[in-house]
């Protein structure tokens, strides 16, 4: 059975069949005996009860309010009432684009990676029994496909597959012909498969510090969505109350990967913080990458070649 209309805000295109199905429909045994009412309210009118006499375009069934078709003046709020159950929807009917086979505001966007499986199936379960035929269009040009009941595309995506795909269902009701259009904007993108995560910058960093002062060690990585970045320190001696890992910052790159940055803050530097390894690790299912920081007293700087310093 077709699921109920749970979204409270709905946008539809004028001239197409449309329905609202309330969500207490499963209480079928109650419904038979209970008084049920559908109401509409719009700017000028408050709660007008709907019935088939309200308009020749409206049909009422047990659970469903049907429009044959929906028109601009159907915009407004709709209510279903049964006993102490009420459901409300806000319906916005928009103009059809007369110059195209679809209306831009009613498009579902999908991103498909090149060479990955790509599928479009034209189905409409609610109106299924009334549909005479269905056509699939790409950029408003009809595609010649085998099945004219449920036309389908199933293939590995290529860049040329990018475009607007419109499923148009043609159906008869009370001697009139109607159509329902569902359009997908398909964008084909580069393969976004996993990279080997990598930490940015030198693998070993000596940081000149003064005792009693604070230092922030910044670790940055390029990683996949499910990878993690963390600092490794003090496992042997237990945790140092002066060491804090700050919240990780993440920004998505144009290629769909992530640039992550995690700071280790060491406050009130003491002797115990000098000449020990603070390791930053990025980990994925494919492996790890680690870079190390060593705090060195400023006075001892002269003993270390300049090129290994991070300030």
């Amino acid at each position: 059975a077709e699921s109920c209309t749970s979204r409270p805000h709905i946008t539809v295109v004028e001239g197409e069949p449309f329905y609202l199905k309330h969500c207490s429909c499963s209480l079928a045994h109650e419904i038979e005996t209970t008084t049920k009412s559908w109401y509409k309210s719009s700017g000028s009118q408050e709660h007008v009860e709907l019935n088939p006499r309200s308009s020749s375009r409206i049909a009422l069934h047990d659970c469903v309010l049907e429009f044959w078709p929906v028109e601009l003046n159907d915009t407004g709020s709709y209510f279903f009432q049964m006993k102490n159950y009420t459901q409300k929807w806000k319906l916005n009917v928009i103009r059809r684009n007369k110059h195209s086979c679809f209306t831009e505001r009613q498009v579902t966007s999908k991103i498909v990676e090149v060479k990955k499986f790509f599928q479009i199936t034209c189905e409409n379960s609610y109106y299924q029994t009334l549909v005479n035929s269905t056509s699939l269009y790409k950029n408003c040009k009809k595609l010649l496909l085998e099945n004219n009941k449920n036309p389908t595309i199933k293939k590995n995506a290529e860049f040329e597959d990018q475009g607007y795909y419109s499923c148009v269902h043609f159906l008869h009701h009370n001697g009139k012909l109607f159509n329902i259009t569902k359009t997908f904007n398909i964008t084909i993108v580069e393969d976004r498969s996993n990279i080997v995560p990598v930490l940015l910058g030198p693998k070993l960093n000596h940081v000149a510090v003064e005792l009693g002062k604070n230092v922030r060690l910044n670790c940055s990585a390029l990683l996949n969505e499910e990878d993690v970045i963390y600092w490794m320190f003090g496992e042997e001696n237990g945790s140092d109350p002066n060491i804090h890992e700050e919240k990780e910052m993440r920004i998505m790159t144009p290629e769909g990967k992530w640039h992550a940055s995690k700071v280790l803050r060491i406050e009130n530097i003491g002797e115990s913080n000098l000449n020990v390894l603070y390791n930053c690790t990025v980990a994925s299912t494919g492996g790890t990458d680690t870079k190390s920081f060593i705090l060195v007293r400023k006075a001892d700087m002269a003993d270390i070649p300049g090129h290994v310093f991070t300030r």
Epitope: D227, V228, M232, G238, S239, A283, S284, T285, G286, T288
Partner: nanobody, 118 residues
């Protein structure tokens, strides 16, 4: 193939407690450091924060935000790592996952949802 199964999450009031468990199947569990990670509702992508970790030798380290409230432990005989969470705060609301700490990750489990709300 290693499988991680987390459990023990739920809805709890601020100040309440929960104990999470994570069982690793098909792995040489005892030689790996293990960690509890969490993914907050507003985290970008699937960003997961390491909140508690335990080495193969049993040493533990905690994120500043949970120190003194969370306790990580492990039972190598049962291939299980635990996270005892006390004095929970609304900021602890997240999906909690366990995984390797200090090495290549295993495939992530489904996680266990912890919601702290009054």
């Amino acid at each position: 193939e290693v499988q991680l199964v987390e459990s023990g999450g739920g809805l709890v009031q601020p100040g309440g407690s929960l104990r999470l468990s994570c069982v690793a199947s098909g792995s040489i569990f005892s030689i790996n450091g293990m960690g509890w990670y969490r993914q907050a509702p507003q985290a970008p992508g699937k960003q997961r924060e390491l909140v508690a970790r335990i080495t193969s030798g049993g040493s533990t380290i905690y994120a500043t935000s949970v120190k003194g409230r969370f306790t990580i432990s492990r039972d190598n005989a049962k291939n299980t790592v635990y996270l005892q969470m006390d004095n929970l705060k609304p900021d602890d609301t997240a999906v909690y996952y366990c995984n390797i700490y200090g090495g290549a990750l295993w495939p992530w489990g489904q996680g266990t949802q912890v919601t702290v709300s009054s």
